[in-house]
């Protein structure tokens, strides 16, 4: 290379060099017809109007008009890579999943890292949880472990998810990020305290994607070959070491290199610095689950490592960059309901909600046959079922095989060995209010025992620096919640807010105007 820069910057140069011996391809239309002139449209005379028969133009333009697909409603901004999972420790006593079959076994994987709230063009260095989703291409179909870089989440009931995400995204009138929305929701739902505390700690802004841990977060169920089941949590710890960005560096990078995370990952892999993560499980027996002091399926809580130690399983290694971002990263679709035999869902309400939501949003974003897209295709298993047709059916549509079941013609048969683990439930069927399921004990342990004095100081500064832009009544609700975690937590934030509030004039009222006909008489009287 004449002017050697980093591999990401030199991608086109590298592509050209790889093809140095080849003659340039013949330019074609989408249908493969050769194109004679790609620089000038057909017109009647040099200044005349265009002709509809200029299919070179219309083919190009029509395709361009349809280039964009809907961005993900959450986790829109992301980076992807490919590699393998290698088993280093035997856990077949817990799970019969083929991915864990024997030590040394390698399974191809695809990974996508992402932020959550930002749009697809947003900065990589914002304070936001990070998605860390892993797709294992196993012989029993794909296993999608759709994790984050935190072991917990803001809510424990999936009915709140749309509202939670709305509160993090843009105000419906101003189209601006709105601290009132963010903190109003968080302050009204104190189960968010654990994740909020993690988010505003030093780990809230990881240094790229290679220096953060991943967690399945939910409780799952593992089932062994004898049909015995345990509950489990998945952890994947970075072998590169945890590194975070300071608030100042993150702000600078969001200006200078908003794609910092994508660039860092691409360049590391392109230069042979393959990032890896050590994969662990925590295991809890059904008996232990009965006596666990909290609901073991509560996504706002962790399982203490001293009681449920990490059990090593294997390594995740990323050694290939995407050949094409749209094909392999934008179109990749992770779905927590993709679980091969040996791995099952627990009663975790958030997981149960995601089992529906994820494939549902993929059908909207990519179409009903999104599993035909090569990056999503379970290519190490033979797909044989009774699903047919639909938009963008991209394979042979299973040929002439019967499309109904049962049938008498030797079409795919059910496998009793793949039956789900059976479990007995009994209980009242109703909407259970979990709002007050101990929202502070584990947060207090995090604040007092996990963080040191300097980290606590930065946590409070980070929170106050964001919370200051919310209205005072919302600030008070939030501080009350933090105070319930620990008096010093709330009062430290309040001391910082006092300074902000004293120095900054506050607009106490946000304008919301509705046409008069929609207003009740009582509301009209107050105008």
């Amino acid at each position: 290379m004449a002017d050697s820069r980093d591999p990401a910057s030199d991608q086109m140069q590298h592509w050209k060099e790889q093809r140095a011996a080849q003659k340039a391809d013949v330019l074609t239309t989408g249908a493969g017809n050769p194109v004679g002139d790609k620089l000038n449209v057909i017109t009647v005379g040099p200044r005349g109007p265009l002709l509809v028969q200029d299919v070179v133009f219309t083919d190009e333009m029509a395709h361009f008009d349809r280039e964009r697909i809907p961005e993900r409603v959450v986790h829109a901004k992301g980076a992807g890579a490919f590699g393998y999972f290698e088993v280093t420790h035997d856990i077949t006593k817990y799970s019969k999943a083929k991915v864990f079959e024997h030590i040394g076994k390698k399974t191809p994987i695809a990974v996508r890292f992402s932020t959550v709230a930002g749009e697809s063009g947003s900065a990589d260095t914002v304070r936001d949880p990070r998605g860390f989703a892993v797709k294992f291409y196993t012989e029993d179909g794909n296993w999608d472990l759709v994790g984050n870089n935190t072991p917990i989440f803001f809510i424990r009931d999936p009915i709140l998810f749309p509202s939670f995400i709305h509160s993090q995204k843009r105000n419906p009138q101003t189209h601006l990020k709105d601290p009132d929305m963010v903190w109003d929701f968080w302050s009204l739902r104190p189960e968010s305290l654990h994740q909020v505390s993690f988010l505003f700690s030093d780990r809230g802004i990881p240094d790229g994607h290679r220096h953060m841990n991943g967690y399945g977060s939910h409780t799952f169920k593992l089932v062994n070959a004898n049909g015995e089941a345990v509950y489990c949590k998945f952890h994947y710890k970075t072998d590169q070491g945890i590194k975070n960005l300071s608030v100042e560096d993150a702000a600078r990078l969001s200006q200078e290199d908003p794609d910092y995370g994508i660039r860092d990952l691409f360049n590391a892999i392109a230069t042979g610095k393959y990032p890896s993560w050590t994969f662990y499980i925590q295991v809890m027996t059904f008996n232990q689950a009965e006596t666990f002091p909290f609901n073991p399926f509560d996504l706002t809580k962790v399982w203490p490592h001293k009681d449920y130690p990490l059990i090593p399983v294997g390594k995740l290694v990323l050694n290939r960059n995407p050949v094409n971002y749209f094909a392999e990263v934008e179109q990749i679709a992770f779905d927590p309901s993709n679980m091969p035999p040996g791995i099952e869902a627990s009663p975790d309400k958030m997981l149960q909600g995601r089992l529906f939501a994820y494939p549902d949003t993929h059908r909207h974003r990519l179409g009903p046959n999104y599993l035909h897209i090569p990056v999503n295709c379970p290519y190490r298993a033979r797909v044989a079922n009774y699903q047919r047709d639909g938009p963008m059916c991209m394979q042979d549509n299973q040929g002439g095989a019967p499309n109904y079941y049962p049938n008498s013609f030797g079409a795919p048969e059910q496998q009793p060995s793949a039956l789900e683990h059976s479990i007995q439930y009994s209980g009242e069927v109703r909407r259970f209010n979990t709002a007050n399921d101990d929202n502070v004990t584990q947060v207090r342990a995090f604040y007092v025992n996990v963080l040191n004095e300097e980290q606590r100081k930065r946590l409070c500064e980070n929170i106050a620096g964001h919370l200051k832009d919310a209205q005072i009544f919302i600030q008070k609700k939030a501080v009350k919640n933090f105070t319930e975690v620990h008096p010093d937590y709330g009062s430290h934030i309040q001391a910082l807010l006092d300074k902000y509030n004293a120095e900054k004039p506050k607009n106490a009222i946000h304008t919301f105007v509705q046409s008069g006909s929609h207003l009740a008489a009582r509301e009209k009287a107050n105008l």
Epitope: Q475, K476, P487, S491, H492, Q494, A495, D498, N501, K506
Partner: nanobody, 117 residues
């Protein structure tokens, strides 16, 4: 009933020092941030300093480096050590708890500080 009783004010020359105290009762003292504010004649209540239960403190830029807030959680007391006093520090000083809100009314009866030669 919450009670805040400020004391320690007085007349002092420019460059001098005073130590204000605030005795607190009626709520769980070691759960809340405490603060000092002041009100000069004809002006609104101005925030001076706040302190967390653990002793973390913040200050208005006008007093930073001269004033020090502290608290004794065992005795339910808050202090404001004021050094290098200036004539513009002349005001009634009030103790407060919880959030400072611009334009609020003072919570206690206050203690007068006059800096004059």
């Amino acid at each position: 009933e919450v009670q805040l009783v400020e004391s320690g004010g007085g007349l002092v020359q420019p460059g001098g020092s005073l130590r204000l105290s605030c005795a607190v009762s009626g709520f769980i003292f070691n759960t809340y941030s405490m603060r000092w504010g002041r009100q000069a004649p004809g002006k609104g209540l101005e925030w001076v300093s706040s302190i967390s239960t653990g002793g973390y403190s913040t200050y208005a830029d006008s007093v930073k480096g001269r004033f020090t807030i502290s608290r004794d959680n065992a005795k339910n007391l808050v202090y404001l050590q004021m050094n290098s006093l200036k004539p513009e520090d002349t005001a009634v000083y009030y103790c407060g708890w919880g959030a400072f809100v611009r334009g609020e009314r003072p919570q206690g009866q206050g203690t007068q500080v006059t800096v004059s030669s």
